[in-house]
């Protein structure tokens, strides 16, 4: 039998035991998080295979992925979303410490897909381990670009409150407009329920006194911000390790001085 | 005093090309957005371009996409409009006008007239 | 055909109270920042109301405006005659990526 011919992406394939993966994680994360003990995890299984499974990796819609959606659905109070660009770590790191506040990746489908790759071919049932479309080498609409795409425009337009965001102070382009929270995520806020956002910008080196915020990226989030109607505020972080350390021991005298 | 002033505007073939110019003073230009904005004669107004404070981010209304280019030089706090291929229908005054936040369009030039006519 | 709907005209009497509307959508008025600008003839437009309903410093508070969902308003109260002018309702239209402009009333002090 001649083997299939297998379409060669730039990318790397789908992560091994990926169904196995997801289902593990979805069985975890609803043990552990009462509001979703009655999700059924097969189902969550089936529709985010349904989303990609069969189908030409380019051609990934989010309309894809509503099936999915619509079983994860989760609210996040208000006042306690955090969004990141380009600073993955610190804030789960933050949340993991900070439990009332919430990354995308804290909630169910950002938890389920976290740092995996995954894609399938044409009319097979096949998932393939082999390659997958680089965003951008092959193409954006790719089932995990498309994948993140849609979950942070639902997490963005959830939003309440006042809405936090970390962003990386050490990045030539500290708020970038082709990242996932500078693409989606700014112009997915609703005025209606966002009263403010606020940036706090992590600053790298540790003799950094620079006030980071009056960065000219910061100051074009800001125009973006406040077309939308929707207040602007910014803080320096300049040391992110004893910022993690107050969020741990807000008692600590040292905390009461500038983080 | 906060100031927009507009040059380079003039009469020109269909066809034909024109570069405008708008140079700030009394404010930090390079902490704005900056706008073209025109006014065809006896019409209302119609919003052309916006560059973003860093230059890194340009946006055009339909009706000029793919003929203007809008650019700023920071160093020299001024603002530019190159457009090429200009129809009759982009006769009108132009004028320039800086964002700002929570505001809108809020400091205006006085305007330099295009006129395109064979 | 303009993104924003206005009235395009208006008229009052010395005095009289004159409302101009503006009407628009989800992606401009309801959700963004509206501002309101005045071209008295021949002159460059001013702004005269700014994030929906706020007076920068110098325009005379005869001048107020309202927003309710996709429409706004702009009203004069004591109307005088310096006040004859174009009148244009303005917002950021998330959809467009565009400043929309109303078409402009033309208020006519009789």
């Known amino acids: 039998v001649l083997p299939r011919w297998r379409q060669q992406w730039s990318g790397s394939g789908t992560t091994s035991r990926f169904p196995e993966t997801v289902l593990a994680r979805c069985v975890k994360y609803t043990e552990v998080h009462p509001e979703m003990r009655h999700v059924d995890c097969q189902s969550v299984w089936d529709a985010f295979k349904g989303a990609f499974i069969s189908k030409y990796p380019c051609n990934i819609t989010e309309e894809d992925y509503q099936p999915l959606v619509k079983l994860g659905t989760q609210t996040v109070p208000c006042n306690k979303t955090l969004l990141w660009s380009r600073i993955k770590d610190l804030a789960h790191q933050f949340t993991q410490v900070q439990r009332d506040m919430f990354t995308l990746e804290d909630m169910l489908l950002g938890y389920l897909a976290d740092d995996l790759t995954w894609c399938g071919e044409f009319n097979t049932f096949e998932i393939n381990y082999q390659s997958c479309p680089d965003w951008r080498k092959d193409c954006s609409n790719n089932p995990v670009s498309v994948f993140w795409k849609t979950v942070s425009r639902r997490f963005a337009e959830t939003a309440c409150g006042v809405v936090h965001v970390m962003l990386n102070g050490s990045r030539s382009k500290i708020f970038d407009k082709n990242s996932t929270f500078g693409s989606v995520e700014v112009h997915n806020l609703q005025p209606e329920k966002v009263q403010a956002l606020e940036a706090w910008v992590i600053h790298g080196g540790r003799e950094d006194s620079r006030d980071l915020c009056q960065d000219p990226t910061i100051k074009e989030l800001e125009s973006i911000i406040s077309k939308r109607n929707i207040r602007f505020f910014c803080k320096n972080i300049y040391r992110p390790d004893k910022f993690l350390q107050c969020v741990k021991n807000p008692e600590d005298s040292s905390c009461l001085s500038g983080i | 005093e906060v100031q927009l002033l507009e040059s380079g505007g003039g009469l020109v073939h269909p066809g034909g090309s024109l570069r405008l110019s708008c140079a700030a003073s009394?404010?930090?230009?390079?902490?704005?957005?900056m706008n073209w904005v025109r006014q065809a004669p006896g019409k209302g107004l119609e919003w052309v371009s916006s560059i973003s404070i860093t230059g890194d981010f340009t946006y055009y209304a339909d009706s000029v996409k793919g003929r203007f280019t809008i650019s700023r030089d920071n160093s020299k706090n001024t603002l530019y409009l190159q457009m090429n291929n200009l129809r009759a229908e982009d006769t009108a005054v132009y004028y320039c006008a800086n964002y700002k936040s929570y505001y809108g369009l809020d400091v205006w030039g006085q305007g330099t007239t295009v006129t395109v006519s064979s | 055909q303009s993104v924003l709907t206005q009235p395009p005209s208006a008229s009052g009497t010395p005095g009289q109270r004159v409302t101009i509307s503006c009407s628009g959508s989800n992606s401009n008025i309801r959700y963004n920042l509206v501002n309101w600008y005045q071209q008295l003839p021949g002159t460059a437009p001013k702004l005269l109301i700014s994030n929906n309903v706020q007076r920068p410093s110098g325009v005379p508070d005869r001048f107020s405006a309202s927003k309710s969902g996709t429409s706004a308003s702009l009203a004069i109260s004591g109307l005088q005659s310096e006040d004859e002018a174009d009148y244009y309702c303005?917002?950021?239209?998330?959809?467009?990526?565009?400043?929309?402009f109303g078409g402009g009333t033309k208020l006519t002090v009789l």
């Open positions: 303005a917002a950021w239209d998330d959809s467009l990526n565009a400043w929309v």
């Open positions: 009394g404010f930090t230009f390079s902490d704005y957005e």
